[in-house]
Interface confidence: low
């Protein structure tokens, strides 16, 4: 059936509407649109003849209508007068007519509303306020928003006058919010600007901060007063009942014991006419001296010396406190406190014991901290590190070696080649090296304060030919789906390209394979049994190339779900039962059997001669791989029938 759908049904003035045609018949001669509920030539909007593809405007055509090939009609720049019914007249090729009517409604766009109020400064717990949404508009719905939320349910909130008026009875400071009204009709919704309700309140009882009531002689007293109030309160201070000043803050520098007493803050609201006061009692105590730390050894040697730190001065009936690295003392057998906590002893100091250390004296009010003290722990040298780590060089390049050893004070360095002293520097540089520069390169680090020396030797080979590489692995027996393996191609050589092969092929593309460290390291993530292959690394430079021997990865896996063979489950009485269990596993698993839950033997094969119906039941094979720590099992039901009772049964082995 031919139907008309209006999209949208409610249209705003100035917008457009589409009269969408559904179920348009086939084989049409043409169609025509009319204003109204019937076909009336005087009210024709547009006609269209399919054969000529010609659209002809009618008497009611306004220039705002557009017809589409599917007979749908678009009307633009809608006016109020467009409201109503529209009829489509369809003429089929057999000249049979069909009609359908649709309609839409036109509404005006609403203006932006505004809010008027009967009281701009209501007083808390006393006044009421009435908000009215302007203008009054026909066929409009009125809504209210408080802080962009719909109105809360409250007996103090009342809507009236068709929801145009919102009354707040007995206002409170919590009613200080953003109020908006909204007008709606089927085609538009407009919100007013915010109106902020300014509720006068307070002052509440003032709060004096900080809450601290005990001070030391010589400190500054800085009290601040605050009372919730609108408009903001005016403040006055009284000390022991005597007026001091009209400010929110009271500041007295360098107080003495004589400044002890009662301090009163008074808050006043000039609009509400209310006053509130709060009193705090301040006590000023005499000042103890600032502590400091002395040490019996300012340059202790690591792993040799002990250090005793003492907190000065000594004061009777005083609690001493210690901090290391701004933390309270850690529990350690190398840290010892004296009975009065005044001396902290560090037994056998290490380089990590440098501190800083602070001590403190506890008094009635607070803790007085010493200045921090840092220990100068002499240590090292540690074994030197020679960099870079290359051991093979090509002739003609420059050799630049650097040596470093952790040491305090910093180490002094010497270089030896094949035991012969070269120079006393941290770096060794030899330009344009030849095969003759191959040899043992020794770095010696010396600590002049501790008198200790340490050496590291590095073999340097200068050769155009690269050595045969080898593969090192961080995991010789990885577990499937659990472990990763990192292969590294040795040695590390300068200006060298590293290559990898798996089973004689170049590396496959896989998210589980990752090259790093300049392709020197090949990492296999989440290894699988299929990774148990031959891995070869190669090194090459511009003049030579070499390959390592293959390394075969031994992946531990399984046991998989076992299989019991033969598959038969029905046997004749008197037959032999010979069950074999197999599970894929590396290394081979341990096998055990259970019949009806009762443990049997730890073998791969279970043999029972001349079975009877008493041997009916569940036969379970259990497999265990001690290397992977994993287990698996399978259960098989066996039925034994008396001889000749069931045709087709297995005779057994």
């Amino acid at each position: 059936k031919l139907t008309i759908e209006s999209t949208p049904f409610n249209v705003a003035e100035g917008k457009e509407v589409l009269l969408l045609v559904h179920n348009l018949p086939q084989h049409l001669f043409g169609y025509s649109w009319y204003k109204g509920e019937r076909v009336d030539g005087n009210r024709q909007i547009i006609g269209y003849v399919i054969g000529t593809q010609q659209a002809t405007p009618g008497p009611a055509y306004s220039g705002r209508e557009i017809i589409y090939p599917n007979a749908s009609l678009l009307i633009q720049n809608i006016i109020q007068n467009d409201t109503g019914f529209y009829t489509l007249h369809v003429i089929k090729s057999d000249l049979v007519n069909e009609e359908a009517t649709g309609q839409f409604r036109v509404y005006p766009e609403l203006p932006k509303p505004s809010i008027s109020s009967n009281n701009s400064k209501p007083v808390e717990d006393k006044d009421a306020v009435a908000f009215t949404c302007e203008p009054e508009t026909q066929d409009a719905t009125y809504l209210w928003w408080v802080n962009n939320q719909s109105l809360p349910v409250s007996p103090r909130l009342q809507l009236s006058n068709g929801n145009r008026t919102l009354t707040l009875f007995n206002v409170t400071r919590n009613d200080t919010a953003s109020y908006k009204c909204e007008t709606q009709n089927p085609v538009s919704a407009r919100r007013s600007d915010s109106v902020i309700l300014n509720v006068l309140y307070g002052p509440d009882a003032p709060t004096i901060s900080p809450l601290n009531t005990s001070y030391r002689s010589g400190e500054n007293l800085n009290l601040s007063c605050h009372a919730a109030s609108n408009p903001p309160a005016q403040y006055s201070w009284f000390v022991n009942g005597t007026f001091q000043q009209s400010t929110q803050e009271l500041f007295i520098p360098n107080i003495t014991v004589n400044n002890s007493g009662s301090y009163t803050c008074q808050a006043h609201n000039s609009d509400t006419g209310l006053n509130r006061t709060t009193v705090t009692t301040i006590t000023v105590y005499a000042e103890p001296p600032k502590p400091f730390i002395t040490s019996n050894n300012s340059n202790p040697v690591e792993d040799e010396d002990a250090v005793a730190l003492t907190c000065e001065p000594e004061i009777q009936n005083t609690t001493y406190l210690w901090w290391v690295n701004n933390q309270s003392l850690p529990v350690s057998p190398r840290l010892q406190l004296s009975n009065d906590n005044r001396t902290l002893t560090l037994l056998s100091v290490t380089r990590n014991d440098v501190g800083p250390y602070e001590c403190g004296i506890q008094n009635e009010l607070s803790v007085d901290h010493s200045d921090p003290v840092i220990l100068n722990v002499l240590y090292g040298p540690d074994d030197p590190t020679i960099s870079p780590s290359y051991t093979y060089y090509r002739p003609g390049v420059n050799l630049s070696l650097s040596c470093h050893a952790a040491s305090n004070p910093p180490a002094q360095y010497s270089w030896l080649i094949d035991g012969n002293i070269q120079q006393h520097t941290q770096e060794l540089f030899i330009s344009n090296i030849t095969e003759k520069n191959s040899g043992l390169y020794t770095c010696q680090a010396n600590n002049s304060a501790s008198g200790h020396s340490r050496t590291t030797v590095k073999t340097i080979t200068v050769s155009a030919e690269l050595p045969k590489p080898s593969i090192s692995s961080n995991n010789s027996k990885p577990v499937e789906d659990k472990d990763a393996v990192a292969f590294t191609c040795e040695p590390e050589a300068q200006n060298t390209t590293y290559l990898w092969w798996v089973n004689g092929q170049s590396l496959p593309v896989s998210p589980r394979l990752q090259l790093s460290n300049g392709n020197r390291t090949l990492t296999l993530f989440n290894v699988t049994r299929n990774d148990a292959r031959a891995y070869v690394c190669g090194i090459q430079n511009s003049v030579s190339a070499n390959r390592s021997d293959p390394v075969t990865l031994d992946v531990l896996y399984g046991p998989d779900t076992p299989i019991i063979s033969p598959p038969d489950s029905s046997y004749l009485s008197g037959a032999n039962l010979n069950l074999s269990c197999h599970s894929a596993s590396n290394p081979s698993p341990q096998y055990s059997w259970r019949i009806n839950g009762i443990p049997q033997q730890h073998t791969q094969v279970l043999f029972i001669a001349k079975i009877t119906p008493n041997n009916n039941g569940t036969y379970a094979c259990f497999v265990s791989n001690l290397a992977t720590g994993r287990n698996n099992s399978i259960v098989k039901s066996i039925t034994v029938s008396a001889s000749g009772t069931s045709p087709g049964l297995s005779a057994g082995a």
Epitope: E16, Y48, T52, A55, I66, I67, Y68, L74
Partner: nanobody
Framework: QVQLVESGGGLVQPGGSLRLSCAAS????????MSWVRQAPGKGLEWVSG????????RYADSVKGRFTISRDNAKNTLYLQMNSLKSEDTALYYC??????????RGQGTQVTVSS
């Protein structure tokens, strides 16, 4: 005299893209509803797409929906048709037209689009 000049047609492989342009002059382009229509060899005129005056309302024939995009630049007096995922059945002479483009309202001379491998 209304002037409409189409350009941007050509030979393209199936799955390819083209962007047609239509330069308008001698009439108030910014206040006119505009359409693209096409005529395949031996076939009648087929409406493809339409766009209202400010470009906020567009419509498409079912055969091109999701593949073609109509747009306009009123400052340049130019209408566009971006054609993606072209098929052999899109081969036709493409016209831009004033209004709904169904027999009333002027058309340009057209630009040929051929989709073939």
């Amino acid at each position: 005299q209304v002037q409409l000049v189409e350009s941007g047609g050509g030979l393209v492989q199936p799955g390819g893209s083209l962007r047609l342009s239509c330069a308008a002059s001698e009439f108030t382009f910014s206040s006119s509803y505009m359409s693209w229509v096409r005529q395949a060899p031996g076939k009648g005129l087929e409406w493809v797409s339409g766009i209202n005056t400010d470009g906020s309302f567009t419509r498409y024939a079912d055969s091109v929906k999701g593949r073609f995009t109509i747009s306009r630049d009123n400052a340049k007096n130019t209408l566009y048709l971006q054609m993606n995922s072209l098929k052999s059945e899109d081969t036709a002479l493409y016209y831009c037209a004033v209004g709904g483009g169904l027999g009333y309202g002027p058309r340009g001379q057209g630009t040929q689009v051929t989709v073939s491998s």
